[in-house]
């Protein structure tokens, strides 16, 4: 029960985190015009990963995309890449984790497979969260560095060189959304990894002992005493219980390290 709860909660937390990473990546307010100690301008500038915007006091807002790829700073490209990698990994992790959820039954998927899938999705969430945190932190560092370089004729926007007194930029809302979302995805991933340990069946060196009686092929299972005869209509081998113990024929056909008494 605790394992299911941990896995479910990890999934939900990761889902919220990845939604946040997507939102942060799409947001325009990665950096916003610093209004402190500045003359009061009637325009407000803010920039995202994909475009820069200007909001006039009248309410008119104009956004321009960064249509150049080569003309953009390498750091911005790196941040874009980190965020996209984070989203892709997170999305794949979500897809994997849906099938790994203990509360969802898909065919005859074994717990061992679910455990492996839970671990895989957990690792993907952790890497996704780290990518988002790294991307946001790199951008924040870039802002802090540029903040003090408020000399005229310096590179001021994401789009190129302009002959003007530099507008100083500070942290935008997207940075905080990204940090929180990355953290949530990371926590969700850790929870999935913890849940994986509970899902994986315990390993043991014991095998089910088979006693062959003349006439009937009977597999004695301690704790189960459910036998399958070799005659009559009951010719198919039946599972004794879900814990991994199998009838003799099954064990012979499909050996598994998870068989235990």
């Amino acid at each position: 029960m605790a394992v299911t709860a941990c896995q479910g909660l990890g999934f939900v937390v990761s889902l919220i985190g990845i939604a946040g990473i997507i939102a942060a990546t799409c947001m325009d307010q990665w950096s916003t015009q610093d209004l402190y100690n500045n003359p009061v301008t009637a325009v407000f500038n803010y920039q995202g990963l994909w475009r820069s915007c200007v909001r006039e006091s009248s309410g008119f807002t104009e956004c321009r995309g960064y249509f150049t790829l080569l003309g953009l700073p390498a750091m911005l490209q790196a941040v874009r890449a980190l965020m996209i990698v984070g989203i892709v990994l997170g999305a794949i992790g979500l897809l994997v984790s849906i099938f790994a959820l203990k509360c969802i039954r898909i065919g005859s998927m074994e717990d061992s497979a679910k455990a492996n899938m839970t671990l895989t999705s957990g690792i993907m969430f952790i890497v996704s969260g780290l990518c988002a945190i790294a991307g946001v932190s790199v951008f924040a560092n870039m802002l802090v560095t540029n903040f003090w370089m408020s000399t005229a004729n310096m590179y001021t926007g994401m789009g190129g060189m302009v002959q003007t007194v530099q507008t100083r930029y500070t942290f935008g809302a997207a940075l905080f959304v990204g940090w929180v979302a990355g953290g949530l995805t990371l926590i969700g991933g850790v929870m999935m990894c913890i849940a994986c340990r509970g899902l994986a069946p315990e390993e043991t060196n014991y095998k089910a002992v088979s006693y062959h009686a003349s006439g009937h092929s009977v597999a004695y299972k301690p704790g189960g005493f459910k036998a399958s005869t070799g005659f009559g209509s009951n010719t198919k081998n039946k599972k004794i219980y879900d814990g991994g113990a199998r009838t003799e024929d099954e064990v012979q056909s499909y050996p598994s390290k998870h068989d235990y008494v």
Partner: antibody, heavy 118, light 113 residues
Framework: QVQLKESGPGLVAPSQSLSITCTVS????????VSWVRQPPGKGLEWLGV???????IYHSALKSRLSISRDNSKRQVFLKVNSLQIDDTATYYC????????????WGQGTSVIVSS | DIMMTQSPSSLTVTTGEKVTLTCKSS????????????LTWYQQKPGHPPKLLIY???TRESGVPVRFTGSGSGTDFTLTISSVQAEDLTVYYC?????????FGSGTKLEMR
């Protein structure tokens, strides 16, 4: 069509307060800003302040302590109040609609003449 | 506050002549975010309120004759009338609309020679 009309007292005694009303039509006060500009006789234009569509008000720094701009959206009216009037506050007072682009004042009222005299 | 300096204060012209009015600001009116200059030009005839001619330093307001052209960037701006007509002989003002307060220039008066 867009129209703005100022109405004021005409003559005001020094140290008194001046209240001017700008009644607008053809546009919404919650969508567009309204600026106040004055022009002393034979002189240039002086920007006094603005009330933006979102209700935010900005005043000329030199007159900030004496100015107040407010509005009544339902009555479609914008109000300018100037306290502690002096002789050099004598001017024609205009209200003007702020355009959507570039903070340009695209429509103006005809203005109301205010004389500060004892 | 930003100081707006217009020159000359008055200018004597003849109809059909090309006229250039200048306006200088004490600070740059260029916004780096959209590379637009926040400067407007107005025309005011005697006994009338000002009329908007140009915004964003070079964008002509609808209904304004094409003979009026705004140009310039940063701190130096010009209003050019390619062929002055009799009705153009009046006062022209430039205005900073970038940094509060929105200060006006002192004006340039066009007079008939």
């Amino acid at each position: 069509q867009v129209q703005l009309k100022e109405s004021g007292p005409g003559l005001v005694a020094p140290s008194q307060s001046l209240s001017i009303t700008c009644t607008v039509s053809g546009f919404s006060l919650t969508s567009y800003g309204v600026s106040w500009v004055r022009q002393p006789p034979g002189k240039g234009l002086e920007w006094l302040g603005v009330i933006w569509g979102d209700g935010n008000t900005i005043y000329h720094s030199a007159l900030k302590s004496r100015l107040s701009i407010s509005r009544d959206n339902s009555k479609r009216q914008v109000f300018l109040k100037v306290n502690s009037l002096q002789i050099d506050d004598t001017a024609t007072y205009y209200c003007a609609k702020q355009g959507l682009y570039g903070h340009a004042m695209d429509y103006w009222g005809q203005g109301t003449s205010v004389i500060v005299s004892s | 506050d930003i100081m707006m300096t217009q020159s000359p204060s008055s200018l004597t012209v003849t109809t059909g002549e090309k006229v250039t009015l200048t306006c200088k600001s004490s600070q740059s009116l260029l916004n780096s975010g959209n590379l637009k200059n926040y400067l407007t030009w107005y025309q005011q005839k005697p006994g009338h309120p000002p009329k908007l001619l140009i915004y964003w330093a070079s964008t002509r307001e609808s209904g304004v004759p094409v003979r009026f052209t705004g140009s310039g960037s940063g701190t130096d701006f010009t209003l050019t009338i390619s062929s002055v007509q009799a009705e153009d002989l009046t006062v022209y003002y430039c205005q900073n609309v970038y940094i509060y307060p929105f200060t006006f220039g002192s004006g340039t008066k066009l007079e008939m020679r």
